[in-house]
């Protein structure tokens, strides 16, 4: 867990922070950066996927988009599902901030969330036959 | 609405209990659109190491193991949130930063036909 937290010399300009916690500015750097979604790779892929949005008002960001593979197998040149190949999810960890209510007090916790980004077509290693 | 600045616990909670983040570690080789992983390291960021995918081929690997240029390998990109030390070098003061990473590659039918 806490890689890179303690080996820095603390400059005089660093803000004072209570023990066991850290100061986090949630004004996002590069907020307006956008992924080009116009290429429709999710529907053109041989392992196509759909998107579902999960929403949680106590999470920042409140919206997290998850990809969902459409098929067990992969789409062949004829547009048919080939079950001898496998569609599999590609996943990436990201950070979110969780707001926790304990009685009248509110605390904040960083969380690692695993997001499914898309799908890829792989040769199987598991053969579901007898 | 979240306040602009919050104090958060130093321990980062892991919600990934159902699945293993390292699970797809061999997909880069088994995919029909294989990729190489490149290490991106930045001590001013948490996590300090992020792996970037680079598609190995323009085309996709066919059933014979050859590159088929009638199909395209393309990167799957995702915006993720990381922590950036702010001010720089401070051990316990961060700002959220959005970065674009290539996570892997997928094989797609082309929309641009690069033919003579």
């Amino acid at each position: 867990g806490s890689e890179g937290e303690t080996f820095f010399q603390k400059p005089e300009s660093c803000p004072p922070v209570p023990g066991g916690s850290m100061k986090l500015d949630i004004g996002i750097i590069n907020e307006n950066q956008r992924v080009s979604m116009s290429r429709n790779i999710e529907s053109r892929s041989t392992s196509p996927w759909d998107y579902t949005v999960t929403w949680d008002p106590n999470r920042y960001p409140s919206e997290v988009v998850q990809a969902q593979c459409r098929n067990l197998g992969c789409i062949n040149a004829q547009g048919k599902e080939d079950i001898s190949m496998n569609s599999v999810p590609i996943q990436q960890e990201t950070l979110v901030v969780r707001r926790k209510h304990q009685g009248s007090s509110v605390s904040f916790q960083l969380e690692k969330v695993l997001v499914t980004v898309g799908c890829t077509c792989v040769t199987p290693v598991i053969h579901h036959v007898q | 609405n979240f306040p602009r600045t919050v104090m958060v616990n130093l321990n980062i909670h892991n919600r990934n209990t159902n699945t293993n983040p390292k699970r797809s570690s061999d997909y880069y080789d088994r995919s029909t659109s294989p990729w190489n992983l490149h290490r991106n390291e930045d001590p001013e960021r948490y996590p300090s190491v992020i792996w970037e995918a680079k598609c190995r081929h323009l085309g996709c690997i066919n059933a014979d193991g050859n590159v088929d240029y009638h199909m395209n390998s393309v990167p799957i990109q995702q915006e993720i949130l990381v922590l950036r030390r702010e001010p720089p070098h401070c051990p316990n003061s961060f700002r959220l930063e959005k970065i674009l990473v290539s996570v892997g590659c997928t094989c797609v039918t082309p929309i641009v036909h690069h033919v003579a």
Epitope: T52, C69, N71, L72, N86, V88, I126 | N18, T19, N20
Partner: nanobody, 123 residues
């Protein structure tokens, strides 16, 4: 946390039919495949069938092909296993589960299991 409730098992004569149901809750937004598995006394749990939530595409183990049919109701988050021409060797406890990596999911990667539903086929 994923919760799985299987039902529909029972005692049936060889050649008979049963329809199993599975209700799944707590699935992640990226869940895309569900499977049926079975475990006979003294044997390891084995894969029976899988279905894609979105496309409805299916995969069966060879011994049940043309006899078993898996279907799903995406809105209700339920899957079903229609079992026809049952044989004594189909006797087992049947389980359903989310397949987080589809057909690539290994048996040791399933975190949660339901209680299962007993299917007994008498000769």
């Amino acid at each position: 946390q994923v919760q799985l409730v299987e039902s529909g098992g029972g005692l049936v004569q060889a050649g008979g039919s049963l329809r199993l149901s599975c209700a799944a809750s707590g699935l992640t937004g990226s869940s895309y495949a569900m499977g049926w598995f079975r475990q006979a006394p003294g044997k390891e749990r084995e894969f029976v069938a899988a279905i894609s939530w979105i496309s409805g595409g299916t995969k069966y183990t060879d011994s049940v092909k043309d006899r078993f049919t898996m279907s799903r109701d995406y809105a209700k988050k339920q899957v079903y296993l229609e079992m026809n021409s049952l044989k004594p060797e189909d006797t087992a406890v049947y389980y359903c589960n989310d397949m987080p990596y589809g057909l690539d999911t290994r048996m040791d990667e399933y975190v949660y299991w339901g209680q299962g539903t007993q299917v007994t086929v008498s000769s």
